[in-house]
Interface confidence: low
């Protein structure tokens, strides 16, 4: 439906508060280095302009596209070239090239200081002094650090953030009330950002068809009682929402997401029996709840898939008539029967089925050729099952920290060219799969583990894309979205790697390590472990374990010493010498 003024349309649909919040997120995700005050000024200007268009849709410039209006506004920033360098060249382009240019300059790892949490009293005072500015600052800081964060979901996080401060700043023990809530929001926020980053990568690097296939599989698992036509409609709408958000069209995205939630709730009888509670919630909570809703029960009397997809004489005819529809139905039917499979496994099975039909439908006897296609699925299913079984056993044996260390060693040996901070971050997240998924029963382990690993490996891919250093990483990241995890699993030690020169400075520690949180201390030790492996890629597990045990003892001893700094200096030298000897450096 065409509107005379797109900006007026979105302002009216979303309301002033959401409009301003979404424009702030959009601007912060594009210009990640700009000060908060500059963004607020730009947002206020856009908002005032939108209000004039609401009053009179025929007013000057009100007919311009949102990209034109927002791009023009971003290009008024005086320090664009000094701050962003070549991104300033985007402003010489016309839409839609200008917006594409801004999108290409989004930085997944911006050079921004770590967010340090102030004292609780300081935060509560700031909250009470100016609640609106306090919450805007939250949106700004998250959006600029996570330029692909799902904008309507960030509004939901901000609502919870506000609720936490409203409740806890009045509590007797403010810190006890607030800090766990903030930790939870931080961890959930990081997870949400990473999940959305995979959706955007899927759309941008592999195209709409890849995203739609993912969505068909996931929604079919979640809504196994919904018929194919219903799932197809949801997939089409969901694809539009994510395409918009990933493309920086945040107002349209939030508006369309609200429409989709409304549609789902109005049609829940033909979608899922699990939606009732979600649909009673306010909009932001409703949309979040729907996105996280548990899988509905599978219908009891589903027929065998073989009849329609293997035994039928019409398989090639049906496939030829509408290839993607037929494959979509196959994926839907397989997925709704297998909530115990990961989405990526289901997509591998569908790809195998497609490849078989492409080959067999051109053969002399197609049926004879594809008759055993389901047998080809067995090894594809068993591979992740076995991998998860082995790794969960290892996790249960080692615990999370040591399991992360095992993965650090494994991945550093596979791709030693990758930067140490990236290897630490990615391996720590890979290691979290243990506590996240191994507690689940068999039927839930694979979808939990393998789909989570897809999200984490995508982090590696997007970070590596910014500064490519390893052909092996590039190959695994770009060849096939659904085979990324098997591709990385299949990598062996990189025999071509020339070990890094030994640098004693890398292994020099100071008393400040003693005041770090347990998590920060782990990261320091894990950073040292990666560096050790880079120096000695052929070191055995036993050698590395001995060095790490010595290192842990050294930190513990010096943190208890009266003169910590001297202890770190003297004992550190001894540790480095002993480690060199142990590893033959």
């Amino acid at each position: 439906d065409a509107h005379k003024s797109e900006v007026a349309h979105r302002f009216k649909d979303l309301g002033e508060e959401n409009f301003k919040a979404l424009v702030l997120i959009a601007f912060a995700q594009y210009l990640q280095q700009c000060p908060f005050e500059d963004h607020v000024k730009l947002v206020n200007e856009v908002t005032e302009f939108a209000k004039t268009c609401v009053a009179d849709e025929s007013a000057e410039n009100c007919d311009k596209s949102l990209h034109t209006l927002f791009g023009d506004k971003l290009c008024t920033v005086a320090t664009l070239r000094e701050t962003y360098g070549e991104m300033a060249d985007c402003c010489a382009k016309q839409e839609p090239e200008r917006n594409e240019c801004f999108l290409q300059h989004k930085d997944d790892n911006p050079n921004l200081p770590r967010l340090v949490r102030p004292e609780v009293d300081v935060m509560c005072t700031a909250f009470h002094d100016n609640e609106e500015t306090f919450l805007k600052k939250y949106l700004y800081e998250i959006a600029r650090r996570h330029p692909y964060f799902y904008a309507p979901e960030l509004l939901f996080f901000a609502k919870r953030y506000k609720a936490a401060f409203t409740e806890c700043c009045q509590a007797a023990d403010k810190a006890a009330c607030l800090l766990p809530k903030l930790d939870e929001l931080r961890d959930e926020g990081k997870a949400s950002s990473a999940k959305q980053r995979l959706k955007c990568a899927s759309l941008q690097k592999f195209g709409e068809r890849a995203f739609k296939a993912w969505a068909v599989a996931r929604l079919s698992q979640r809504f196994p009682k919904a018929e194919f036509a219903e799932v197809s409609k949801l997939v089409t709408d969901l694809t539009k929402v994510h395409t918009e958000c990933c493309h920086g069209d945040l107002l349209e995205c939030a508006d369309d997401r609200a429409d989709l939630a409304k549609y789902i709730c109005e049609n829940q009888d033909s979608i899922s029996s699990k939606l009732k509670e979600c649909c009673e919630k306010p909009l932001l909570e409703k949309s979040h709840c729907i996105a996280e809703v548990e899988n509905d029960e599978m219908p009891a009397d589903l027929p065998s898939l073989a009849a329609d997809f293997v035994e039928s004489k019409d398989v090639c005819k049906n496939y030829a008539e509408a290839k993607d529809v037929f494959l979509g139905m196959f994926l839907y039917e397989y997925a709704r029967r297998h909530p115990d499979y990961s989405v990526v496994l289901l997509l591998r099975l569908a790809k195998t089925y497609e490849t078989t039909l492409e080959k067999c439908c051109a053969a002399a006897d197609p049926h004879e050729c594809y008759a055993k296609v389901f047998d080809e699925f067995k090894p594809l299913v068993e591979e992740p099952q076995n991998l998860i079984k082995q790794n969960c056993e290892l996790f249960e044996q080692l615990g999370e920290y040591k399991f992360q260390n095992a993965l650090l060693v494994r991945y550093t040996k596979k791709v030693p060219q990758v930067s140490t901070p990236t290897l630490v971050e990615v391996s720590r997240n890979l290691g979290k799969v243990g506590s996240k998924c191994c507690k689940h029963p068999e039927a839930k382990r694979m979808p939990c583990a393998e789909d989570y690993l897809s999200v984490v490996l995508n982090q590696l891919c997007v970070l590596h894309e910014k500064t490519p250093v390893s052909d092996r990483v590039t190959k695994c990241c770009t060849e096939s979205l659904v085979n990324r995890r098997p591709c990385f699993s299949a990598l062996e030690v990189d025999e071509t790697y020339v070990p890094k020169e030994f640098n004693a400075e890398t292994f020099t520690f100071h008393a400040d390590i003693c005041t770090l949180s347990e998590k920060e201390r782990q990261i320091k030790k894990q950073t040292a472990l990666v560096e050790l492996v880079k120096h000695k890629p052929k070191a055995t597990k036993e050698q590395l374990k001995a060095v790490m045990d010595d290192f842990a003892a050294f930190v513990e001893k010096c943190c208890k010493a009266d003169d910590k700094e001297t202890c770190f200096a003297e004992e550190g030298k001894k540790l480095v010498a002993a480690s060199q000897a142990a590893l033959g450096l």
């Epitope: 018929e227 599978m298 329609d308 049906n318 509408a322 139905m329």
Partner: nanobody, 114 residues
Framework: EVQLVESGGGLVQPEGSLRLSCRAS????????MGWYRQPPGKEREFVAR??????HYADSVKGRFTISRDNAKNTVYLQMNSLKPEDTAVYYC?????????WGEGTLVTVSS
């Protein structure tokens, strides 16, 4: 191409029963939705019932009185209509959904009258 042929319509007394059949031929597979719509005299076509593996849906006006079923081996869908009322009088159309469109039969007339 898909062809659908309905049968089983006719004249029946109020509170009586009828069983409609619809046989599909052509490019058919059992996992697709099949079902029934009807068009009362002088009114728009309206949804009656549909069936999908493991799932059935009914219009509120027929719930508890009509039962849809399917025989995949015969590519046939049935509509068992009990406790018929005069307002059930209509041409009943069978449909089959594939590739984002519905295929329709020619229709069979059901008249409920004393």
């Amino acid at each position: 191409e898909v062809q659908l042929v309905e049968s089983g319509g006719g004249l029946v007394q109020p509170e009586g029963s009828l069983r409609l059949s619809c046989r599909a031929s052509g490019s058919i597979f059992s996992i697709n939705t099949m079902g029934w719509y009807r068009q009362p005299p002088g009114k728009e076509r309206e949804f009656v019932a549909r069936i999908y593996p493991g799932i059935t849906h009914y219009a509120d006006s027929v719930k508890g009185r009509f039962t849809i079923s399917r025989d995949n081996a015969k590519n046939t869908v049935y509509l068992q209509m009990n406790s018929l009322k005069p307002e059930d009088t209509a041409v009943y159309y069978c449909f089959y959904y594939y590739d984002d469109r519905n295929y329709w039969g020619e229709g069979t007339l059901v008249t409920v009258s004393s």
